[in-house]
């Protein structure tokens, strides 16, 4: 008899007819940029400070009647879904909201920078706990408004924004498209995506992770004890704003990069139907649906991983695309993805003191992504080693020749237009599994990490016959950091990790015919840190 | 409404006296840039937020946003300082015509200049 | 069905604390659906929230008794209790203890107040 | 707080006639007013809720009205059973009761 988004982000070991997690959030402080809120309605009475902070634009409309319990519908009923003593997420977590959205729920670009600004300044005056920002709120793409989130996050603030309730992709909005934002998609209780009306949540790969989102149980500004049930992507960022004020009251030390990547690895995993996705979009956007931890502690063992996928190329003949991992992430390994098959592969490269993975556009290709695994891997130093062309029939090869160092993936970029029409490498030896192998004509890249206790091992799966995706997956305990494909021949479209599983993708298998170059390996470097393991049993 | 334009003439007449004294060459480098929202009903022109490069501090963010203002006066244009910026992003939010775009896109210390657009609730 | 019953002393000293307890029967109090309420009525009076708890322990209290009032809820025994301290002549009263739909499990209904107990007259007296 | 006055203190009618009671709030309530039937030595019994919504169990004959600040009891018949006090309660704002109206046979 529990409302179903509480269930659903219940891990089993919790559920009962009451949801009662340990910890509910109470070291954290949870900021609220929205609407004006009903603060003495009885699910926050008492846990919700509402700042002296308003910025809002007026009302559009000469007839417009401000009519309270309106006003304060949209704030009030997030702050119910965050903290709401028996409908809220982290039911000890305390707020305080910032009113940025008028009684239509409108704002400005500028008034929510200010209301960061205030936050800041906050923080500052008076530092206290882990601080959530929750913006419910979406606009155009904004470099400003992207910009503030950023500083405020590297001021190590965690910001917590909605999709956008558009049905498009997430990249055209901000805060959604800000990368050190955790921005959310709508589920529903069928974990499928949320159609709000002709629309629905935003998609795409500048959404971190969905969380229940439509007809969600909360506090109703229309009294003082009533309960509406809303919908929209300002619902899915309530519990994960909630999540993350449980995760940060039982570990105040996380940092955001730690933070989303235990929320991504909690994540229940590819239980939303990809179908409601345009095409394009199905491979860019997360299959996750946010939940709680099981455990509050021992996470801390694992190596966690993510996916990052870059922005499109676009179609010229020499674009790139370039994805990044966040400052406390490593890049572990790199890939590329082209629906044509036209690239020209990828490489690791250092840009500002830090690694990115870059992906090359073939000419008459229509584009590129590049697709970064960016892990947590504390005391790591990672570098690249190159081979260039070999131009032997065996193919290139490099390998990880420093002491201590263990490939953690493999990378090849090529200059030459068609890889297809030349003669596919050999396999590579066994027994050799500090060593990417490539095609003759291709520089490879490895990535070659020195962390304590990081031990890697090479998982490949290979098909003779023609197929238009194999996969590879790292087993229990162990981490997916590389993906990549054998042999790198043209009708690859390209490799890139979902999950801990490595996925090759191949054209359209019609096209192909089933010649020795249909055979496709998926090669896994999988990854385990025993040093993490050790430090988590210490703390136990 | 009358009383905002009001204190905005008296502020600008203010200003004038000090516009003698202030050059107006841009900063050697990299041109500032103008950005605004792709989706055009959420626009809101006239209002800017004006950002300048990292490093800038609040006295040289109320310098740049003073000289502004007097460069704008001497075109015949009123402007209003709405806020500076300063804690997280180097800056000023102001109202202005369009029309002074360029002029402040040469300002010194400028990195970019974005109108400002609606933001609504999801 | 759902039945209500207090108990407790009929009569409190001035100054001293009431204490009642409210036994369900026929129905789970460690449910979603509903908050359990207290209310009180004067001789020949009209009724007086005084306030609710859920299962979960979040309490809710008339702003005017705020400072008096303590609820409690034993799930295990599908209890609450009723504790009002620094009584006087002023708190002799039937006290009920009635369910209230929360609101939070929408098929509950709104949150009216029914079935009640049949309630308990408590006098404050030396 | 939110003050609900209850008129007429008393209302003298005979069983078979048109019963009429009013509910005054100190302030909007919206629809979230509810009205209680309580006769002597037995608790409340809930009757109307969210201002014209019979509860379950309740015979036709008794039917709520209004909005705002103005509410209304309507007992279109009276029966024998009928004759007792009746309170309104709001939860607009936490939970408040009227002072009641006690309906006697005249």
């Known amino acids: 008899s529990i409302p179903w988004n509480l269930e659903r982000i219940t891990p089993p070991r919790y559920r009962a007819d009451e949801y009662q997690p340990p910890d509910g959030g109470s070291l954290v402080e949870v900021y609220l940029l929205d609407t004006s809120i009903q603060s003495d309605h009885r699910e926050i009475e008492g846990r919700v400070m509402v700042t002296d902070f308003e910025n809002v634009p007026e009302e559009d409309g000469t007839r417009f009647h401000r009519q309270a319990s309106k006003c304060d519908s949209h704030g009030t009923h997030l702050a119910g879904v965050v903290s709401g003593r028996d409908a809220g997420v982290a039911k000890g977590a305390s707020m305080r909201s910032l009113r940025v959205l008028n009684c239509q729920g409108k704002g400005t670009v500028s008034g929510t920078l200010i209301g960061l600004e205030f936050i800041r300044k906050s923080q500052l005056v008076q530092p206290v706990g882990p601080l959530v920002v929750l913006l419910p709120l979406a606009g155009g793409y904004s470099r400003v408004l992207n910009a503030a989130c950023q500083r405020l996050a590297r001021a190590g603030v965690v910001l917590v924004t909605a999709a956008g309730n558009f049905r498009d992709d997430a990249c055209l909005y901000s805060p959604a498209s800000a990368p050190e934002v955790i921005t959310v998609g709508a589920t529903n209780a069928q974990d499928q995506p949320v159609t709000l009306g002709t629309l629905g949540t935003n998609f795409g790969r500048c959404v971190d992770l969905f969380a229940p989102g439509e007809d969600i149980i909360g506090a109703s500004s229309d009294c003082s004890t009533c309960f509406v049930s809303q919908s929209g992507t300002s619902q899915a960022a309530a519990h994960v704003a909630g999540i993350a004020a449980m995760m940060l009251s039982a570990e105040p030390e996380l940092t955001l990069a730690e933070l989303r990547q235990r929320l991504i690895h909690f994540s229940a995993k590819d239980v939303i139907n990809e179908a409601w996705f345009p095409e394009d979009q199905r491979v860019l956007t997360p299959n996750l649906v946010a939940a709680l931890p099981p455990s509050t502690h021992g996470a801390g063992w694992q190596l966690f991983c993510r996916t990052v996928w870059s922005a499109h190329s676009g179609p010229t003949r020499m674009a790139t695309a370039v994805a990044r991992c966040a400052p406390d992430e490593e890049l572990l390994s790199c890939s590329s993805f082209s629906r044509s098959g036209k690239r020209r592969g990828e490489r690791m490269e250092a840009q500002g003191g830090k690694l990115v993975c870059r992906a090359h556009n073939a000419f008459g290709g229509e584009g590129v992504y590049a697709i970064a695994r960016c892990c947590l891997l504390p005391q790591a130093n990672c570098s690249v080693h190159t081979a260039p062309p070999a131009e032997a029939s065996m193919g290139t090869r490099v390998h990880c020749h420093q002491q201590g160092h263990v490939l953690t993936g493999c990378s090849s970029h090529w200059e030459v237009e068609d890889l297809g029409t030349h003669k596919p490498p050999v396999l590579r030896p066994r027994g050799q599994p500090n060593q990417c192998v490539g095609h003759r004509e291709a520089s490879i890249h490895a990535s070659c990490c020195h962390a304590p206790g990081l031990e890697c091992k090479v998982k490949e799966h290979g098909i003779p016959a023609p197929q238009e995706q194999v996969t590879v997956a790292c087993e229990e305990g162990w981490t997916l950091t590389g993906c990549s494909a054998l042999p790198g021949t043209s009708h690859v479209l390209g490799a890139y990790a979902v999950d801990n599983t490595c996925v090759v993708r191949s054209r359209d298998v019609s096209t192909t015919g089933s010649t020795s170059e249909g055979a496709v390996t998926a090669v896994a470097i999988c990854c385990r840190s025993r040093h993490l393991a050790q430090a988590s049993q210490e703390l136990q | 409404q009358e009383d905002e334009d009001g204190d905005y003439e008296e502020l600008v007449l203010a200003l004038r006296s000090e516009e003698d004294g202030l050059a107006e060459a841009p900063e050697h480098g990299t041109t500032a840039t103008f950005h605004r929202c792709a989706k055009d009903p959420w626009r809101l022109p006239g209002t800017y937020v004006v950002v300048l490069k990292e490093e800038t501090h609040l006295s040289q963010s109320e310098r740049t946003a003073r000289r502004l203002q007097a460069q704008a006066a001497r075109r015949g244009y009123l402007t209003k300082i709405l806020h500076v910026f300063h804690g997280l992003l180097p800056g000023f939010l102001v109202k202005m015509s369009g029309d002074l775009l360029e002029l402040a896109l040469k300002l010194p210390h400028v990195d970019y200049i974005e109108e400002d657009s609606s933001v609504f609730a999801q | 069905q759902l039945q209500l019953q207090e108990s407790g002393p009929g009569l409190v000293k001035p100054s001293e604390t009431l204490s009642l307890t409210c036994t369900v029967s026929?129905?789970?109090?460690?449910?979603?659906?509903?908050?359990w309420g207290w209310i009180r009525q004067p001789p020949g009076k009209g009724l007086e929230w005084i306030g609710s708890i859920y299962y979960s322990g979040s309490t809710y209290y008339n702003p005017f008794l705020k400072s008096r009032v303590t609820i409690s809820v034993d799930t295990s025994k599908n209890q609450f209790s009723l504790k009002l301290s620094s009584v006087t002549a002023a708190d002799t009263a039937v006290y009920y203890c009635a369910r209230e739909n929360s609101g939070v499990v929408p098929a509950a209904g709104p949150n009216w107040f029914g079935p009640w107990g049949q309630g308990t007259l408590v006098t404050v007296s030396s | 707080e939110i003050v609900l006055t209850q008129s007429p203190a008393t209302l003298s009618l005979s069983p078979g006639e048109r019963a009429t009671l009013s509910c005054r709030a100190s302030q909007s309530v919206s629809s979230y007013l509810a009205w209680y039937q309580q006769k002597p030595g037995q608790a409340p019994r809930l009757l109307i809720y969210d201002a014209s919504n019979r509860a379950t169990g309740i015979p036709a004959r008794f039917s709520g009205s209004g909005s705002g600040t103005d509410f209304t009891l309507t007992i279109s018949s009276l029966e024998p059973e009928d004759f007792a006090v009746y309170y309104c309660?709001?939860?607009?704002?936490?939970?408040?009761f009227g002072g009641g109206t006690k309906v006697e046979i005249k």
């Open positions: 026929g129905g789970s109090i460690s449910s979603s659906s509903y908050y």
């Open positions: 309660q709001q939860r607009r704002n936490w939970f408040t």
